[in-house]
């Protein structure tokens, strides 16, 4: 155990010409305040990735209202060191996201507004328990000055934390096995204390809180003998015993993530996922709430009702995550159809459609029609996505290649007889009817019920409708 | 034809974890977003999020941060939620439905899940 | 977030009838707004996306219109299996969003 310690000692306008403007103003005074990110290993990580080392955020700085036309100088910077508690052993390489924030504190409804100012990463190597290490990053036309080391919390002492040390129990010397303490030489290295209940003769550990099996063996505690029945395990018996080797004890086994983290494996080790609130290798590191300002980008925190959510980020538009640090990405909605690629705009979204396709999703086939053939006569209309034949009269189906009925719907009205003809279809009306449908009744004096006769034509003349 | 198939009614008690299925067939399954719909009994509908199914990238509306998540069997054409340390509030029927661009144009027939103690 | 509102929770109407149910947004949505269909056996269906344009499947006599915030839903010649509860959602700003619904029923 022990703890990664960052000092910031200035945050402000690089060498070189095209100095920043002023992050704040007389209108909008602001104060800084700073982010920091760990990751175990060398791997070049998205700022998005979880903060598996841990992280931590500085207290807000003293406000800062700019001079009218002075120069921006070094921002006043928050009090103190930023502290990054890590609970196992310290892995030597690591990577870190330092992200400096101004919350500005003009008259902005719903409290201040935070924006990114820069952010800076690296991949260092750093034992513990050495000096301070001073580094200098740009981000744009800044430049953040800052010292970082990595301590172990005694009784953990070495470069990774692992070794324990305890005060000598003889003036003299240190028991079996055990070496003095560098550079505690009053002190005894200690054994190491493996997982509680791991079993002194079937287990050992080369780190704090581990459990690891002699041949034979398994279980969580080492305490379960490998079965000595007829070898069902694919990996065949065991050459050193009779019985047969099953897997030891998985990295997961036993959960090794704390506060409701759960547990996957990696190809080296394990990995945690945790619930809000716990962060750190094994979800160990918890406590953070509103006061430690975890919305970025102007989210609004808000406290959570259980322990599963000590905070909820509400995002502004533009914004996700657990603590809006990610930028909506528009285009992760997969918007666009038939291999159009998608371009998130900011103000809107963006289909560029591929060859053959059109429309503000790309969902227009361009080439319906081609080589789509209508039979009989009929005619192609693009659309949708897939094409459709409007058929000539006397003719269906997807393709116009099914003779239609055309009287099939029943056309003819008030019991008019129907006709399939080769122009279309006639109906013989029943007494009283008439009408190209039999839809208008004859009234007994001659009149009908048709309505206004077109120029030329005399109502009632029913041979002139036909 | 294009169909979301969900797996079946869940009872479960305070505190446990549910996790629901939406299958997918009729078309691919990797060109459009997924998402989920909740509907509180004799309630409207709300929008909870989507996952990306090219990705396995999700996205939460506010309210669903924290105990939910959703995830995917790409090689199976599923998506899931799961939903952790359940509360009374979350008795529901939850929807998956795809995106087409403009509208979640094809909806799962729903999963109804009673938290009750 | 924006707010959608369908004022009338209810409707009944009869057979034949033309109904018209709206839907106001809390601001400009660029007609980026979806009409659902939830039957009362919970099936949900898209109807109509982006404003007008109706989804396969769905029959003519469903139509949707509007601008800016305001949106409406026409059933032009209403029928039995039209009962069921519909629902307008914004698609223009995450998170998406629902109206309240308004319930369809027969008189």
């Known amino acids: 155990a022990g703890v990664f310690e960052l000092q910031i000692h200035s945050f402000g306008p690089g060498p070189g010409p095209g100095a920043p403007r002023s992050p704040c103003s007389a209108r909008l005074p602001c104060r800084l305040f700073f982010r920091v990110c760990l990751k175990p290993g060398l791997s070049e990580e998205a700022a998005e990735s979880p903060c598996a080392l841990g992280a931590a955020l500085s207290a807000r700085g003293p406000v800062y209202t700019e001079q009218p036309g002075a120069p921006a100088p070094d921002l006043p910077l928050p009090d103190g060191l930023l502290q990054v508690p890590f609970r196992d052993a310290w892995p030597g390489t690591f990577s870190f996201i330092i992200e400096t924030w101004r919350e500005e504190l003009g008259d902005q409804i719903g409290g201040p507004a935070w924006s990114l100012l820069a952010r800076v990463a690296g991949r260092r190597r750093l034992a513990a328990g050495g000096p301070w290490a001073r580094d200098i990053q740009r981000a744009g036309a800044w430049e953040l000055r800052f010292s970082y080391r990595a301590r172990c919390e005694p009784p953990a002492v070495g470069t990774a934390c692992t070794r324990l040390c305890r005060p000598r129990s003889a003036p003299s010397r240190c028991g079996p096995g055990l070496r003095p303490c560098a550079p505690l030489e009053d002190e005894c290295e200690a054994p190491l204390v493996c997982r509680a209940g791991c079993s002194p003769e079937h287990g050992f550990c080369e780190q704090p809180g581990e459990c690891r099996c002699l041949e034979g063996w398994t279980g969580p505690l080492c305490t379960v003998p490998v079965s000595t029945s007829s070898c069902l395990s694919p990996r065949g018996p065991s050459s050193a015993t009779t019985g047969c080797l099953v897997p030891g004890p998985g990295p997961c086994d036993g959960n090794p993530c704390a506060n409701g983290g759960s547990c996957s494996e990696t190809p080296r080790s394990f990995e945690c996922t945790c619930p809000r609130g716990f962060y750190g290798l094994r979800c160990e590191v918890s406590g953070v709430t509103c006061a430690d300002g975890p919305c970025f980008n102007g989210g609004l925190c808000v406290g959570g009702a259980d322990p599963d959510s000590a905070y909820i980020c509400h995002c502004p538009p533009g914004f996700q995550g657990s603590n809006c640090e990610k930028r909506v990405d528009r285009c992760s909605l997969q918007p666009c159809r038939n291999g159009g690629l998608c371009l998130d705009l900011g103000h809107a979204l963006r289909c560029r459609c591929r060859a053959g396709f059109a429309g503000p999703r790309c969902e227009h086939d361009l080439d319906d029609c081609a080589g789509r053939a209508c039979a009989n006569g009929g005619t192609c209309v693009e659309g949708g996505g897939a094409h459709r034949c409007s058929c000539a009269l006397g003719f269906g189906g997807r393709d116009c290649r099914e003779r239609a009925d055309p009287c099939a719907a029943r056309p003819c009205a008030h019991g008019g007889r129907c006709y399939a003809h080769f122009s279309g279809l006639v109906c013989a009306c029943a007494p009283g009817y008439m009408g190209a449908r039999c839809e208008f009744p004859v009234h007994p004096d001659g009149a009908s019920a048709l309505p206004a006769a077109p120029p030329g034509l005399r109502p009632g003349d029913p041979q002139r409708y036909l | 034809q294009i169909q979301l198939v969900q797996s079946g009614p869940e009872l479960k008690k305070p505190g446990e974890t549910v996790k629901i299925s939406c299958k997918a067939s009729?078309?691919?399954?990797?060109?459009?977003?997924m998402h989920w719909v909740k509907q509180a009994p004799g309630k409207g509908l709300k929008w909870m999020g989507w996952?990306?199914?090219?990705?396995?990238?999700?996205g939460y509306a506010d309210d669903f941060k924290g105990r939910f998540a959703f995830s995917l069997e790409t090689s199976a054409s599923t998506a899931y939620l799961q939903i952790n340390n359940l509360k009374n509030e979350d008795t529901a029927t939850y929807f998956c439905a795809r995106y087409d661009g403009y509208a979640m144009d094809y909806w799962g027939q729903g999963t109804s899940v009673t938290v009750s103690s | 977030d924006i707010q959608m509102t369908q004022t009338t929770s209810s409707l009944s109407a009869s057979l034949g009838d033309r109904v018209t149910i709206s839907c106001r947004a809390s601001q400009d949505i660029s007609n980026y707004l979806n009409w659902y269909q939830q039957k009362p056996d919970g099936t949900v269906k898209l109807l109509i996306y982006?404003?007008?344009r109706l989804h396969s499947g769905v029959p003519s006599r469903f139509s949707g219109s509007g601008s800016g915030t305001d949106y409406s839903l026409t059933i032009s010649n209403l029928e039995l299996e039209d009962i069921a509860t519909y629902f307008c959602q914004q698609g223009d700003m995450l998170p998406w969003t629902f109206g309240g619904g308004t319930k369809l029923e027969i008189k």
């Open positions: 982006h404003t007008s």
């Open positions: 996952i990306n199914t090219e990705t396995g990238e999700p």
């Open positions: 009729g078309y691919t399954f990797t060109d459009y977003s």
